[in-house]
């Protein structure tokens, strides 16, 4: 049941439910936008972002973008709606509980991106091959 004051002030299209009809709550994500990073040649890194932010919409997920060029390395942490592309890429792994980095083709830089749907999941970004989605155990976790 939706409380009366919420019914009055929230548009129906804002009330998001999951496949079981449960009301989805807005997720908490690390949200520091773009920051310089020292994360390089590691299996996984912490974001070092001290801001845990509530996402604007219940359907939004956590995203992390790691970029390296000749000058620097940056890590971007945000909330984003998986129905919309981010940096021109679809968020294919938005249902994953972990943020598992996938390389994307971007000229002039090395570009990795991940998305995930558990609280603060973009705090720990994973590059390690052992976590890639050819791992059947991970697929089980993601699609359960």
């Amino acid at each position: 049941t939706i409380p009366p004051h919420v019914q009055k002030s929230v548009n129906n299209d804002m009330i998001v439910t999951d496949n079981n009809g449960a009301v989805k709550f807005p997720q908490l994500c690390k949200f520091c936008d773009v920051r310089f990073s020292t994360c390089d040649n590691q299996k996984s890194c912490m974001s070092n972002c001290s801001i845990t932010s509530i996402c604007e919409k219940p359907q939004e997920v956590c995203v992390a973008v790691w970029r390296k060029n000749d000058e620097n390395i940056t890590l971007e942490t945000v909330c984003h709606d998986p129905k919309l592309p981010y940096h021109d890429f679809i968020l294919e792994d938005a249902a994953s509980p972990k943020c598992i980095m996938k390389e994307k083709k971007k000229p002039g830089e090395t570009f990795f991106m991940c998305s995930c749907s558990s609280d603060e999941c973009n705090d720990n970004i994973i590059f390690s091959e052992e976590y890639n989605t050819s791992n059947p155990d991970l697929l089980l976790v993601i699609f359960q």
Partner: antibody, heavy 121, light 107 residues
Framework: QLQLQESGPGLVKPSETLSLTCTVS??????????WGWIRQPPGKGLEWIGS???????YYSPSLKSRIIISEDTSKNQFSLKLSSVTAADTAVYYC?????????????WGQGTLVTVSS | EIVLTQSPATLSLSPGERATLSCRAS??????LAWYQQKPGQAPRLLIY???NRATGIPARFSGSGSGTDFTLTISSLEPEDFAVYYC?????????FGQGTKVEIK
């Protein structure tokens, strides 16, 4: 209309564990429509968020208290509880259990009347 | 964590007067700000959430405004039962934090 009622000892010794229970009526703690949590208020001071949980088992604990807190639920009794370990005099406060609509995560519509817990030997 | 600063600490007014309470955040909280009323010996009561939405059963004399870092709670005409402490609370960044409170007392 949701109603919440805190219960537990009013006096806890330093270094021991504070245990409180919140009994909910007028709604189910398994409902996806609501989140549940604990807030405290030291005598004569302001409010401090302790932690909260959601129907899916997701919990969020205040970073400053994270190492000492456990919030758990007992759906069969429609109760949830707070355990705060290694208490000191600074943990003396009125403890409130509260609830809010899930989508408006963090705003609290319904509160218990509060229970004063004093930490003293 | 985000610090909320409320002003004034105490507001002395008479019934029928207009009360204007301020809450300033140390960084943007977007529109994710709530206001609560607390009377002595009672739990807080949610008045306003997300800056300007009145909660269930809250009279129209209570209104909220603002976004970003500056927010206002206005009580258009004080009733005797409105004399209490008012807290603002943000839920933009977690953990949620509360202001230190503004006491509205009878002049």
């Amino acid at each position: 209309q949701l109603q919440l009622q805190e219960s537990g000892p009013g006096l806890v010794k330093p270094s021991e564990t504070l245990s409180l229970t919140c009994t909910v009526s007028g709604g189910s703690i398994s409902s996806s429509s609501y989140s549940w949590g604990w807030i405290r208020q030291p005598p004569g001071k302001g409010l401090e968020w302790i932690g909260s949980f959601y129907y899916s088992g997701i919990t969020y604990y205040s970073p400053s208290l994270k190492s000492r807190i456990i919030i758990s639920e007992d759906t069969s009794k429609n109760q949830f509880s707070l355990k705060l370990s290694s208490v000191t005099a600074a943990d003396t406060a009125v403890y409130y259990c509260a609830s809010g609509f899930t989508m408006i995560r963090g705003a609290l519509d319904y509160w218990g009347q509060g229970t004063l817990v004093t930490v003293s030997s | 964590e985000i610090v909320l600063t409320q002003s004034p600490a105490t507001l002395s007014l008479s019934p029928g007067e207009r009360a204007t309470l301020s809450c300033r955040a140390s960084q943007s909280v977007r529109s994710f700000l709530a206001w609560y009323q607390q009377k002595p010996g009672q739990a807080p009561r949610l008045l306003i959430y997300d800056a300007s939405n009145r909660a269930t059963g809250i009279p129209a004399r209570f209104s909220g405004s603002g976004s970003g870092t500056d927010f206002t709670l206005t009580i258009s005409s004080l009733e005797p039962e409105d004399f209490a402490v008012y807290y603002c609370q943000q839920r933009s960044n977690w953990p949620p934090t509360f202001g230190q409170g503004t006491k509205v007392e009878i002049k």
